[in-house]
Amino acid sequence: ELCDDDPPEIPHATFKAMAYKEGTMLNCECKRGFRRIKSGSLYMLCTGNSSHSSWDNQCQCTSSATRNTTKQVTPQPEEQKERKTTEMQSPMQPVDQASLPGHCREPPPWENEATERIYHFVVGQMVYYQCVQGYRALHRGPAESVCKMTHGKTRWTQPQLICTGEMETSQFPGEEKPQASPEGRPESETSC
């Protein structure tokens, strides 16, 4: 079941998943000057069964000048924001990721892919946050968010992370320096 909205935005932080649950969509987005091919998929889909999962469909980009019913316009000016979704940096692959049943690995990049990946997550997905370069992480608890189904509605738990403007970066799980977390795992459940 798809999550109704996106994971929470944390100022000066980005998030990523270590693996993607079956049913996850990854939009086929192309970099500026390119677009999905006319007969190209809208998204890639993590599909399969408990023993083997893989990405269905392939994203393909072509020059946007090649099709007369596609236009490229200059977007309205807006404030520059930190990217909140997975950026195309070198993806970090935990060694055990492939062995997670019902999950897909980070898909390899496709030619002329956009710099930012847009995922549609499913219930049960967990994402991990890290501060962007130049910001330091202050943890009150886990720097993660989980999409949960509560009373027929989906929602993301609130990650316990604050990024402060000090020149030190925090890493994703597996590369993180141990930090004291005196409080227990914070409950961000909401009653209804």
């Epitope: 798809l2 109704d4 909205d5 996106d6 935005e9 049913g23 969509m25 939009n27 987005e29 192309c30 500026r32 677009r35 006319k38 007969s39 190209g40 998929s41 809208l42 998204y43 889909l45 599909t47 269905d56 469909n57 946007s64 596609t70 236009k71 490229q72 316009v73 200059t74 977007p75 309205q76 807006e78 909140k84 979704t85 956009a114 930012e116 847009i118 549609h120």
Partner: antibody, heavy 114, light 107 residues
Framework: QVQLQQPGAELVRPGTSVKMSCKAA????????IGWVKQRPGHGLEWIGD????????NYNEKFTGKATLTADTSSSTAYMQLSSLTSEDSAIYYC???????WGQGTLVTVSA | DIQMTQSQKFMSTSVGDRVSVTCKAS??????VAWYQQKPGQSPKALIY???YRYSGVPDRFTGSGSGTDFTLTISNVQSEDLAEYFC?????????FGGGTKLEIK
């Protein structure tokens, strides 16, 4: 929660144009395509086109090229569709959709009448 | 353009029954098919994506199946609130196209 707000109705004269809005809330507007769908009784649903507010791309169904013009304003998280040279054939409900068709607006009923 | 054909415009069923709404694509669309439910006076609601995956909040009595050119939306244990029109849609190739709709009537 994701919401797409559209005005309920527009009454317009033949030969004129109309510009309808779709205000998005509850998600990052610039990340997702916004599409437009036409519904007329007996004609089912027709996809008009879509726009990527962040990337600035627009795709049109060739049937609506010259009829519909799609724009988006990221500062107000609002998408717009302008329909020109209106005739009775343009009387319909127009829906905006987003997040891979997961979310639909309530629709704007356009009535073209003298 | 790819045509999506829902051959049955109307289907009649009873509460508790199982009903299957079918949709045929004019060419192979893989599993790039969605199903929508539209109740009278309301906007369409997304039920199924990628032929067989349910959106959140959609009861599990709604099941999608098929690939290639033939697709089915099955409603098991039909409830009175399922009275609606059901549309299929392909998003395999521009322009995205919809089926003509199947109206489900409850006896």
């Amino acid at each position: 929660q994701v919401q797409l707000q559209q005005p309920g109705a527009e009454l317009v004269r033949p030969g004129t144009s109309v510009k309808m809005s779709c205000k998005a809330a509850g998600y990052t507007f610039s990340n997702y395509w916004i599409g437009w769908v036409k519904q007329r009784p007996g004609h089912g649903l027709e996809w008009i086109g879509d726009i990527h507010p962040g990337g600035g791309y627009i795709n049109y169904n060739e049937k609506f090229t010259g009829k519909a013009t799609l724009t988006a304003d990221t500062s107000s998280s609002t998408a717009y569709m302008q329909l020109s040279s209106l005739t009775s054939e343009d009387s319909a409900i127009y829906y905006c959709v987003s997040r891979n068709f997961a979310n639909w607006g309530q629709g704007t009923l356009v009535t073209v009448s003298a | 353009d790819i045509q999506m054909t829902q051959s049955q415009k109307f289907m009649s069923t009873s509460v508790g029954d199982r009903v299957s709404v079918t949709c045929k694509a004019s060419q192979n669309v893989g599993t790039n098919v969605a199903w929508y439910q539209q109740k009278p006076g309301q906007s369409p609601k997304a039920l199924i994506y990628s032929a067989s995956y349910r959106y959140s909040g959609v009861p599990d009595r709604f099941t999608g199946s098929g690939s290639g050119t033939d697709f089915t939306l099955t409603i098991s244990n039909v409830q009175s609130e399922d009275l609606a029109e059901y549309f299929c849609q392909q998003y395999n190739s521009y322009p995205w196209t919809f089926g003509g709709g199947t109206k489900l009537e409850i006896k």
